[in-house]
């Protein structure tokens, strides 16, 4: 059974209970490349950040190139998505408990800024895949994800006809596409310039406060 984020009292500056996450966020000076925006405060270690940049990394044995070489412009979004997943301490309001062998918690319906989703889709819709949900249904017999028998490789656009189909369907609704734009303080940015600070801190505060109000209303 799932329980909601409201069942956690700690919605701000928290790390998820999952396979590679630290238990407590903190500075990580040596975060690698696309994960470097989280240097000041991260749930991932330097070695995790290094590993997730590799094709078929040891973190999950997940092969982005399951239908031939994924375009580099596309792959960078998947790396960034993984950085956000592994490193962000600002997704507490969307943590859900799950009963999975490899993790106790996951994110659900994180409000992703609409431009981040749009750009992800635009940069990927000519790369190839064979599935519209990448959480389940793979053939793992070789130790690495392969397309299940009869699942044809086609363009992303075939499996994800819209940006929302990609961002919401890909990881079983880990994200939901927000109507808000980057910089609004109301949606999570996958991409940000850390020189300006982490914009997702404000977003987490806003939604944590809203959840607190809603929880209070339900008690009265």
């Amino acid at each position: 059974t799932m329980c909601s984020a409201q069942d956690r009292t700690d919605l701000l500056n928290v790390c998820m209970d999952a396979k590679h996450h630290k238990t407590k966020p903190g500075p990580e000076d040596k975060l690698h490349d696309q994960c470097s925006p989280w240097k000041k405060n991260a749930c991932c270690t330097a070695s995790t950040s290094q590993e997730l940049h590799k094709d078929t990394s040891r973190l999950y044995n997940f092969n982005w190139d399951h239908c031939g070489k994924m375009e580099p412009a596309c792959k960078r979004h998947f790396i960034q998505d993984t950085c956000l997943y592994e490193c962000s301490p600002n997704l507490g309001p969307w943590i859900q408990q799950v009963n999975q062998s490899w993790r106790k918690e996951r994110f659900l319906d994180v409000p992703l800024c609409k431009e981040d989703c749009q750009r992800w889709w635009e940069d990927c819709h000519t790369s190839h895949t064979c599935k519209s949900n990448w959480h389940r249904g793979w053939d793992w017999t070789s130790g690495v994800n392969k397309c299940p028998a009869g699942a044809l490789c086609r363009t992303f656009e075939s499996y994800f006809p819209t940006p929302a189909a990609l961002c919401e369907g890909l990881w079983s609704h880990s994200y939901k596409v927000s109507n808000y734009s980057r910089g609004s303080g109301r949606c999570i940015q996958m991409w940000f310039d850390s020189a300006q600070g982490n914009p997702n801190e404000e977003v987490a505060r806003f939604y944590a406060a809203a959840m607190h109000v809603n929880a209070g209303e339900m008690l009265h």
């Epitope: 397309c147 363009t155 656009e157």
Partner: antibody, heavy 118, light 108 residues
């Protein structure tokens, strides 16, 4: 590099059958659909049918239903198109083509000319 | 039988812009794909899906669609663009594919 190499030209008598092969290389054969398209001299391209090279499922154009059979040999990364009960109107260049998005054919074979003549 | 209709022939002056159209009911719910075919050669995919160009296809080729009509636009036509152009589309019922009759493009 993706390549589709087809078998050579054929001359057949009316009523006979022809089987054209298409050998794929440079990609995972079983991960893509293969379609067959023909073009009679000076005419439009005409879709005949396709096979899911992974599980062998097929779909045929109504026009060719009952006369065309598309198969594949995964160990040889080869697709085949057999057309039976040939008539003179079947004289055409036959192409195999890899499908990347419901009718988007990014790679084509070089074509096989089949001539039906008594 | 589902059909896609194309103008049989279109001409364009060298360096000018030309639009080739494709009409059919299947285009209301499916994108058109566009192929260039030169005499004695296999077709070459030039535009597919929403407006995607395979690598190696010049950016003077672009695609668009509205209602039951899809268009291939060549901006600044070159002599090398003289060829037959075919559209095709998925027919959702039964996952079949249908081709248009082709348009012969002449570059003057």
């Amino acid at each position: 590099e993706v390549q589709l190499v087809q078998s050579g030209a054929e001359v057949k008598k009316p009523g006979a059958s022809v089987k054209v092969s298409c050998k794929a290389s440079g990609y995972t054969f079983t991960s893509y659909a293969m379609h067959w398209v023909r073009q009679a001299p000076g005419q439009r391209l005409e879709w005949m049918g396709w096979i899911n090279a992974g599980n062998g499922n097929t779909k045929y154009s109504q026009k060719f239903q009952g006369r065309v059979t598309i198969t594949r040999d995964t160990s040889a990364s080869t697709a085949y198109m057999e057309l039976s009960s040939l008539r003179s109107e079947d004289t055409a260049v036959y192409y195999c083509a890899r499908d990347i998005s419901y009718g988007s054919f990014d790679y084509w074979g070089q074509g096989t000319l089949v001539t039906v003549s008594s | 039988r589902p059909e896609l209709t194309q103008d049989p022939a279109v001409s364009v002056a060298l360096g000018q812009t030309v639009r080739i159209t494709c009409q059919g009911d299947s285009l209301r719910s499916n994108y058109a794909n566009w192929y260039q075919q030169k005499p004695g050669q296999a077709p070459v995919l030039v535009i597919y899906g929403q407006n995607n160009r395979p690598s190696g296809i010049p950016d003077r080729f672009s695609g668009s669609s509205s209602g039951n009509t899809a268009s291939l636009t060549i901006t600044g036509a070159q002599a090398a663009d003289e060829a037959d152009y075919y559209c095709d589309s998925r027919v959702s019922t039964g996952n079949h594919v249908v081709f248009g009759g082709g348009t012969k493009l002449t570059v003057l």
